[in-house]
């Protein structure tokens, strides 16, 4: 099945400093966004290989992408407090599937002490559930649209 | 979650044309991956076309250079441009997110014959 493996589980950073937040996917994906978690989910970026990525405007002029869409690092830079949260990727295939979260602290530079990440991977509760029938499409009509050709992303 | 409401289906002789529209609501429009779907009398929903945030767009084989689908992110909307219509492409059009799989919207039907 497919999967997306999502790396770190969690870093803690200073305010102003950059990370790094990879994903992963063994191919076959049609694009593959970055959500920050929360009571309202918001999109960061989307990133589709070929094509120019689409990014919220909060993080316009801070992000870049090395990689590509199946094994993607995304950098967020110069961030700010109000960018602590969960990150979790979720990749456009024929099911849709997550990563396993990104825990971000964006700390004052004075107590990066007191805030620090356990080993231990973002609690499951953290992450959306996969809504129900979240095949893409409909698992009956799976085979429907055959994979893109590599060509037709390019603008 | 955007809201997603079709129109612009009707009666239409085979050859002939139709623009289907799909009007969202909320504020997340230009990330939503958007797909139109169909459901023929008796058969299972099919998707037809998609297109992603990127505007990529991919379509299912019988529809192939007949079918066009667009979008316009200013003004929250997705299209569905159908020429060259068959007898077989009668069916209720729906539209939805694919990231998200909220519920279906009541679709618009579109009905190709002599």
């Known amino acids: 099945a497919q999967e997306v493996q999502q790396s770190p589980h969690c870093t803690t950073v200073p305010v102003g400093a950059s990370v790094n937040i990879t994903c992963s996917t063994s191919g076959g994906l049609r694009g593959i966004y970055l959500r920050q978690l929360g009571p309202q989910p918001q999109d960061i970026i989307y990133y589709e290989d070929g094509v120019v990525p689409t990014t919220d405007r909060r993080f316009r002029g801070r992000i870049d992408f090395s990689g590509s869409q199946d094994n993607l690092t995304i950098t967020m830079h110069r961030l700010q407090l109000s960018d602590t949260g969960t990150y979790t990727c979720q990749a456009i295939t024929e099911v849709n599937v997550y990563g396993s979260g990104t825990l971000v602290l964006v700390t004052e530079e004075q107590s990066q002490g007191w805030h620090r990440c356990s080993d231990a991977p973002p609690r499951a509760s953290a992450l959306p559930a996969p809504p129900t029938g979240s095949a893409l499409p409909d698992p009956q009509t799976a085979s429907a649209l055959p994979d893109p050709p590599a060509a037709s992303a390019l603008p | 979650q955007v809201q997603l409401v079709e129109s612009g289906g009707g009666l239409v002789k085979p050859g002939g044309s139709l623009r289907l529209s799909c009007a969202a609501s909320?504020?997340?429009?230009?990330?939503?991956?958007m797909g139109w779907y169909r459901q023929a009398p008796g058969k299972q929903r099919e998707l037809v076309a998609d297109i992603s945030p990127g505007n990529s767009t991919n379509y299912a084989d019988p529809v192939k250079g007949r079918f066009t689908i667009s979008r316009d992110n200013a003004k929250n909307s997705l299209y569905l441009q159908m020429n060259s219509l068959r007898a077989e492409d009668t069916a209720v059009y729906f539209c939805?997110?694919?990231?998200?799989?909220?519920?279906w919207g009541q679709g618009t039907l579109v009905t190709v014959s002599s």
């Open positions: 909320g504020s997340s429009f230009h990330f939503a991956f």
């Open positions: 939805r997110d694919l990231r998200s799989w909220g519920a």
